[in-house]
Interface confidence: medium
Amino acid sequence: MKVLQEPTCVSDYMSISTCEWKMNGPTNCSTELRLLYQLVFLLSEAHTCIPENNGGAGCVCHLLMDDVVSADNYTLDLWAGQQLLWKGSFKPSEHVKPRAPGNLTVHTNVSDTLLLTWSNPYPPDNYLYNHLTYAVNIWSENDPADFRIYNVTYLEPSLRIAASTLKSGISYRARVRAWAQCYNTTWSEWSPSTKWHNSYREPFEQH
């Protein structure tokens, strides 16, 4: 049994880091493998992660972490029974994938303005709370070409757009994702999408 693709890990910079790797053949990850991880810190203890299958030869493990600070470094040991298959390390702050925003809501009752709001996925005491920026994706269910991205580079988790920038009388969906420039993170997953029917009063045309 050998590791074909070494584990790569990303952290949500809060409580979970996810590591993925591939073996050289079909493997029952949860029964055959264990990923041991330990914070390089005098008071820390080793923890064991039981991997799950992620395709025939792929494995994924969700490492639980109390909290994360930028100086943290973890040792990782991948075991198959008594055999050490791979040894490495992982610095969460250098491999951050933020949590996805939640509670995306479209408020349509604000005088021909659409107000989209969502929740910051981090608690206020987390470093990323004040460092997230967002991308909002809006698309038409009827027209695949009607697909747009709005970059929200301010901290407030909201976006206002004129309803008239979208077509009237059809349904739209929106979703939002986050990233943090400070740690050069990857984008988060998209939030669940929300749907609304776009309608607004056409301006009276004078001839």
Partner: antibody, heavy 120, light 106 residues
Framework: QVQLVQSGAEVKKPGASVKVSCKAS????????INWVRQAPGQRLEWVGW????????YYNEKFKDRATLTVDKSASTAYMELSSLRSEDTAVYFC?????????????WGQGTLVTVSS | DIQMTQSPSSLSASVGDRVTITCRAS?????MHWYQQKPGKAPKPWIY???NLASGVPSRFSGSGSGTDFTLTISSLQPEDFATYYC?????????FGQGTKVEIK
Amino acid sequence: QVQLVQSGAEVKKPGASVKVSCKASGSTLTDDYINWVRQAPGQRLEWVGWIFPGNGNSYYNEKFKDRATLTVDKSASTAYMELSSLRSEDTAVYFCARGLVRYRALFDYWGQGTLVTVSS
Amino acid sequence: DIQMTQSPSSLSASVGDRVTITCRASSSINYMHWYQQKPGKAPKPWIYAASNLASGVPSRFSGSGSGTDFTLTISSLQPEDFATYYCQQWSSYPITFGQGTKVEIK
């Protein structure tokens, strides 16, 4: 809100022992490392050792290993530091302080300090 | 033992000044903490793990550094900031503190 309340000032003769208490409220002490730190007049802070009440494990600064004893009474939420064979250079304010792994062992709560004076 | 050396040992500054205190470890460490102490009082936690402000610490304070060199910076000194600041390491035993930096009013 966690509070650490220490026993009152002590005056001791050289060669004697002193036992300082540190009572915790708002915390069960279970997940806390209770540290003892001293500060002689005008000097830097000096770490004596820690005790982990969850299992009674303790760890000492080699400098104090032979003279300091750290204990805990979990039922009373109280930690103790006993220092024996006192000498004049042990005159200092002794603090208890909680260290949490979550904050990478930052001492986040401190007692008010107990002045121990060693004088003949 | 890892020796922690702070510089300067004391400094005089005026309200509004930018102040930087440095702490050098005699060998590389992974976690550095800072405390503020006022006369007759216990130290208060100020910055943990080099750069994270402890609860209630004003945002004019910041911390940085890694390895052997760490800094505490006050962007605009306020009257309540006059105190002694200590660095501390818990990366190897024994836990050690710097000798302190006393920030005084000019």
